[in-house]
C-alpha cells in the first residue's frame, strides 16, 4: 500500500485561533479524528467535503476537526482566540507570490501583466476556452484569479477581458524575490518553505522524517513557525529540515534585502568593554580565549578551517581575531592559535552590569540593585518589611529603606559578603545570594590590611582560667570524626557551634559526624573523664570562596576544666607581623610510630607580601588571607590538621586569627603557610551564631 | 534513599507524570533535581523543586515539563507534551539540604525510570 | 551556561594519569562544580564537590582543581576500574544547574 504523503506542510498554523463566520451562508464540515493531520490530508484531497478546503481548525479538546472553503483573509469571516483551537490555512490561498511556475499559486491576483482585468473563468465572453472549472477539478479555476492549471512556462495568466487580447501572464512575482533577509537571516520571519532546490521543507514542530531538537516550545524566540526556513543556530543564511527522507537538511534561497537594514529589534545592545546578555553585540577587541592563547584570525583557515568567516557573517563585525559571538553561543568565542585547541571562550571579558538583573557586585554589593530574589540553596527570598525587626536586631543604624524593595537581594547590613536575604525558612534564617562579585573590581571590603588599626583583641584583661595547666589551654580544640575516626580539627568559639573548613565533611549526612571535645589523644585514650561526644545539627558554610564552615552542635557543650570556647578577633583587624602564634592537630606527623596525642607547632605572623616572596611570587594573597611562616623548618600544619585554628595572642588574650585549610604542601621548609583569615569573616560568623537557631541546654 | 516510578512507553504528545519517592529524608530541608539521560547520551539538568518547593528550570525545559513537590516525600516530573526527543532514563537527585547550607551538589541518586516516547 | 568538557574521550594504561577539563561559558557561583563517574546501567556516583573537596568514599588519587570558568579532574595511578564516563556539573546565579556532555575513560 502506498504511504499517503502528509500533506500539514502545505498550511500555515496559526495556535489558539479559530474562524467564526458572520455570514450564515457559508458552509462548515466537522468530523471527529485524532490529529491536525488527518484534517490536514482530507483539506488538502477534498474527500468527501462538498467544498473547496481552505482552512481548518483543529479542536485538541474535542478532538474535532472543522473544514472551511474560506480563510481568515475571506470576507463574512472574523479570527477569534480559543484555548483550544489552532488554525490550519492553506498557504497557496494565502500566499501572493510564487513558487517555480506557479502550478500551486491560489491567489487572488486578478490583472494581467499589462494591467487588463481578468475573465472569469467560468464566462466564455469575450473569449471561449475549454478551461473550465470541472474540468480542472483542484486547479481552483476560482472568479477571475491569475491561474497556471497546466504549470506553463511563464506562470499564473488568464482571459483578459479586452476582446483584443485572449490571454496575457499576471505579474505575480517569485517568492525568492519577495523574501528577503539581512546578514545571515537570524531574525528572518518570512514565509519561504522550500529550499534552494524546491523540496518542500518539514514542519518545525514534526519530527519526521527528519528528528531533530529545534522544538518551537523549547526556542520560543526563533520563529519556528510552520515549516518556514529559519537560522536558528548561525548558519551562513537560513535553511530547512527537508521532506525528502534522504535530504536532511538544505539551505533556502533566500536573497538579501537591498538596504541589508536591520529592525532595531534584531540589533543587539553594541558594547566594547563587556557583555551584555550572551555577548553577540560584543564590539571590543579583547583577542585571547580566556587563558591568554591568542584568537586565529576569522578570515583564515589556519591552524583550523572553519566556515565562520567575514564573508558568511556578514553583520557580526568579524575583524581581525577579536572575540565574537557570530552564532548565539553562550558568550563571545574564537578559534584559538593552538592547533590543539579549536575553540575557546573569551569568558575574561566582564558582564556590563545592568540595573535589573545585575550579575555581579561592586564592593560589598551595599548599592547592588539587582532583582535576583532566591538564596545560594534555592530559597525564595522573603519581603524586607516582613523582617524589620529582625534586621533592627543585629545593625544599629536606620536601614535604606529606598533600597529594601520587594524581596530582592540586599546588603542593608553592610555584610563584608555580598547581597543576601531572609527566607521565612527557621533552619536557614538568612542566607547569602548566589551573586558573585564583578570580575576585576578591585574594591576592597576591608582596608589597611598590613597596618595594625584595629586592634584584633577585645579586651585587654588576662585571662586564666582557675590557673589550670597547659592541657586546659587547648579545651577548644575539636576533634572532628567521619564515621567514627578523626578526620578534621575544629575551634569552639561558641557552646553550640564548631569553627572548622570545608573540606572536612566528604558526606552530607550529618549522622557520619561527630564532635569530641576535652580530649587530648586522638582516640580519647586517658580522657575518659573528661571526653564530650556531640552529635552534629547543622553544617553552615561559609560566603562564597571562603572555605569556612560554622558547625552547629546538637547540643550545647559544657564549659568546664577541659572544654572552652576560644575568642574571635574583631572584625578586619590586623595582627602585626612577627607576632608568635601556633597551630594545633592531630595530623600527619611525619613519624612512623605516631602516638595520637595533640601537637603545637610554633609560627609566626608574616605581612601578605613577604609571604608572596617566600612562595617566590607564585601566590598573591588577599584580604581573606593570613600568612604565618615557622620558627622550626619544616614545621606546621598538615593532613587531620585541616579546620584546626592558627592561635594567636594579643594583650594577654588568645584569638584564633586563621584556620587551616589543604594548601600548597605540608610543612614545606621556607614556605609558610597560608590560613583562612578569621577576622575577615567575623560578621559572618557572628550573624550566624546571633541568627542560627540552637538547642538549648 | 531516593527512587523515580512512572516510566513507560508513551505515544508522541500524551503527558505523563514521573513521581520520585523519598525515605530517610525530608522533602522540607532538601531540594530536588530532575536530571535525564537519553541512550548513549550524556546527562542534562532539568530542573529542580528547592527546599521551599520553588521551582527551577533550564532553559529549554520551560514550559515542556513541570516539577511539583506534592508531599513531604514526593517530588514530580510532569512531561507535558512528550515528543520522542524525550526518550530517556530519568534521574532524581538531591541538590541542596538545609542541614548543609552552602554545598550545592548531587549526592544522593535514584537509580532512575526509563521513559519511551514512540508512535 | 554551557560546560564544555575535553576530550570527549581518553585512553591510559593501568597507573597512568588521565586530566580531564571543564569548560564554563560563564562563572561558576562559589566554584560549585563537582565530578561524577558513571558506570554503563549505573547512577552517578560524586567524586569532588565544590571544585576540590573529596566525596565520600573517593580516593585521593581523584583531584579536582580550578576556579572561576576552567576546571579540572585529574585521574593518577590509574586503575581498571577507573574505566567510566565523568561529567562536571556547574551551579550558577538563578540557581540553574548544567552537566558538561562527559568524557569517556578508557583503561588500558
Known amino acids: 500500500q502506498r504511504k499517503r504523503r502528509n500533506t500539514i506542510h502545505e498550511f500555515k498554523k496559526s495556535a489558539k485561533t479559530t474562524l467564526i463566520k458572520i455570514d450564515p451562508a457559508l458552509k462548515i464540515k466537522t468530523k471527529k479524528v485524532n490529529t491536525a493531520d488527518q484534517c490536514a490530508n482530507r483539506c488538502t484531497r477534498n474527500k468527501g467535503l462538498p467544498f473547496t478546503c481552505k482552512a481548518f481548525v483543529f479542536d485538541k479538546a474535542r478532538k474535532q476537526c472543522l473544514w472551511f472553503p474560506f480563510n481568515s483573509m475571506s470576507s463574512g469571516v472574523k479570527k477569534e482566540f480559543g484555548h483550544e483551537f489552532d488554525l490550519y490555512e492553506n498557504k497557496d490561498y494565502i500566499r501572493n507570490c510564487i513558487i517555480g511556475k506557479g502550478r500551486s499559486y491560489k491567489g487572488t491576483v486578478s490583472i494581467t501583466k499589462s494591467g487588463i482585468k481578468c475573465q472569469p473563468w467560468s464566462s466564455m465572453i469575450p473569449h471561449e476556452h475549454s478551461f473550465l472549472p470541472s474540468s480542472y477539478r483542484g486547479k481552483d479555476l476560482q472568479e477571475n484569479y491569475c491561474r497556471n492549471p497546466r504549470g506553463e512556462e511563464g506562470g499564473p495568466w488568464c482571459f483578459t477581458s479586452n476582446p483584443e487580447v485572449r490571454y496575457e501572464v499576471c505579474d505575480i512575482p517569485q517568492c525568492s524575490e519577495v523574501e528577503c533577509m539581512t546578514c545571515n537571516g537570524e531574525s528572518y520571519r518570512g514565509l519561504m518553505d522550500h529550499t534552494e532546490s524546491g523540496k518542500i521543507c518539514q514542519r518545525w514542530d514534526h519530527q519526521t522524517p527528519h528528528r531533530h531538537k529545534f522544538l518551537p516550545e523549547r526556542y520560543p524566540d526563533k520563529g519556528f513557525d510552520d515549516n518556514y526556513c529559519r537560522n536558528p543556530d548561525g548558519q551562513p543564511r537560513p535553511w530547512c529540515y527537508t521532506l525528502d527522507p534522504h535530504t536532511r537538511w538544505e539551505y533556502c534561497a533566500i536573497k538579501t534585502c537591498a538596504d541589508n537594514t536591520m529592525n532595531d529589534t534584531d540589533v543587539p545592545l553594541e558594547t566594547t568593554e563587556c557583555i551584555q546578555g550572551q555577548g553577540e553585540g560584543y564590539r571590543g577587541t579583547v583577542n585571547t580565549i580566556w587563558n591568554g592563547i591568542p584568537c586565529q584570525r576569522w578570515d583564515s583557515q589556519y591552524p583550523h578551517e572553519h566556515d565562520m568567516t567575514p564573508e558568511n557573517f556578514k553583520c557580526k563585525d568579524l575583524r581581525e581575531n577579536y572575540c565574537r559571538n557570530p552564532d548565539g553561543s553562550e558568550s563571545p568565542w574564537c578559534f584559538t592559535t593552538d592547533p590543539n585547541i579549536r575553540v575557546g571562550y573569551c569568558s575574561q571579558i566582564p558582564n556590563c552590569d545592568m540595573s535589573h538583573g545585575q550579575d555581579c557586585y561592586r564592593g560589598n554589593g551595599k548599592n547592588y540593585m539587582g532583582n535576583l530574589s532566591q538564596t545560594r540553596s534555592g530559597l525564595t527570598c522573603s519581603m524586607w518589611d516582613k523582617n524589620m525587626e529582625d534586621l533592627h536586631r543585629h545593625i544599629f543604624w536606620e536601614p535604606d529603606a529606598s533600597k529594601l524593595n520587594e524581596n530582592y537581594c540586599r546588603n542593608p547590613d553592610d555584610d563584608a559578603h555580598g547581597p543576601w536575604c531572609y527566607t521565612g525558612n527557621p533552619l536557614i534564617p538568612w542566607d547569602y545570594c548566589p551573586i558573585s562579585r564583578c570580575e576585576g573590581d578591585t574594591t576592597p571590603t576591608i582596608v589597611n590590611l598590613d597596618h595594625p588599626v584595629i586592634s584584633c583583641a577585645k579586651t585587654k584583661q588576662l585571662r586564666v582560667v582557675n590557673g589550670i595547666p597547659t592541657r586546659t589551654n587547648i579545651g577548644w580544640m575539636v576533634s572532628l570524626r567521619y564515621r567514627n575516626k578523626h578526620i578534621c580539627g575544629g575551634s569552639l568559639i561558641k557552646e553550640s557551634w564548631v569553627l572548622t573548613a570545608r573540606q572536612c565533611f566528604p558526606s552530607r549526612d550529618l549522622k557520619d559526624y561527630e564532635a569530641w571535645l576535652g580530649i587530648h589523644d586522638v582516640h580519647g585514650r586517658g580522657d575518659e573523664k573528661c571526653k564530650q561526644v556531640l552529635n552534629v545539627s547543622q553544617l553552615v558554610y561559609g560566603p562564597e570562596g571562603s572555605d569556612l564552615v560554622l558547625m552547629k552542635l546538637a547540643r550545647p557543650a559544657v564549659l568546664d576544666d577541659f572544654v572552652s570556647t576560644i575568642d574571635l578577633p574583631n572584625y578586619g583587624c590586623t595582627i602585626p607581623e612577627k607576632t608568635s602564634c601556633s597551630v594545633y592537630g592531630w595530623g600527619y606527623t611525619g613519624l612512623i610510630n605516631y602516638d595520637g596525642l595533640l601537637r603545637v607547632a610554633h609560627l609566626y605572623i608574616m605581612g601578605n607580601e613577604k609571604c608572596s616572596q617566600h612562595h617566590r611570587g607564585k601566590v598573591t594573597l588577599n584580604e581573606s588571607e593570613i600568612c604565618a611562616g615557622a620558627e622550626k623548618i619544616g614545621s606546621g600544619p598538615c593532613e587531620g590538621d585541616y579546620g584546626g585554628p592558627l592561635v594567636c595572642e594579643q594583650h594577654k588574650m588568645r584569638m584564633v586569627l586563621g584556620v587551616i585549610v589543604p594548601g600548597r604542601g605540608c610543612a614545606i621548609p621556607n614556605r609558610p603557610g597560608i590560613f583562612v583569615r578569621v577576622a575577615y569573616y567575623a560578621k559572618w560568623i557572628h550573624k550566624i551564631i546571633l541568627t542560627y537557631k540552637v538547642p538549648q541546654s | 534513599s531516593v527512587e523515580e516510578s512512572g516510566g513507560r512507553l508513551v505515544t508522541p504528545g500524551t503527558p505523563l507524570t514521573l513521581t520520585c519517592t523519598v525515605s530517610g529524608i525530608d522533602l522540607n530541608s532538601n531540594g530536588m533535581s530532575w536530571v535525564r539521560q537519553a541512550p548513549g547520551e550524556g546527562l542534562e539538568w532539568i530542573g529542580a523543586?528547592?527546599?521551599?518547593?520553588?521551582t527551577y528550570y533550564t532553559n529549554w525545559a520551560k514550559g515542556r515539563f513541570t516539577i511539583s513537590k506534592t508531599s513531604s516525600t514526593t517530588v514530580d516530573l510532569k512531561i507535558t507534551s512528550p515528543t520522542t526527543e524525550d526518550t530517556a532514563t530519568y534521574f532524581c537527585t538531591r541538590g541542596e539540604y538545609a542541614g548543609v547550607v552552602g554545598s550545592n551538589y548531587f549526592d544522593l541518586w535514584g537509580q532512575g525510570t526509563l521513559v519511551t516516547v514512540s508512535s | 551556561q554551557v560546560l564544555t568538557q575535553t576530550p570527549p574521550s581518553v585512553s591510559a594504561v593501568v597507573g597512568g594519569t588521565v586530566t580531564i577539563n571543564c569548560q564554563s561559558s560563564?562563572?561558576?557561583?562559589?566554584?560549585?562544580l563537582s565530578w561524577y563517574q558513571q558506570k554503563p546501567g549505573q547512577t552517578p556516583k560524586p567524586l569532588i564537590y565544590?571544585?576540590?573537596s573529596l566525596a565520600s568514599g573517593v580516593p585521593s588519587r581523584f583531584k579536582g582543581s580550578g576556579s572561576g570558568t576552567q576546571f579540572t579532574l585529574t585521574i593518577s595511578d590509574l586503575e581498571c576500574d577507573d574505566a567510566a564516563s565523568y561529567y562536571c556539573a556547574g551551579y550558577y546565579s538563578g540557581h540553574i544547574y548544567s552537566f558538561g556532555g562527559g568524557t569517556e575513560v578508557v583503561v588500558k
Open positions: 523543586s528547592s527546599i521551599d518547593g520553588t
Open positions: 560563564q562563572r561558576i557561583y562559589s566554584n560549585w
Open positions: 565544590a571544585a576540590s
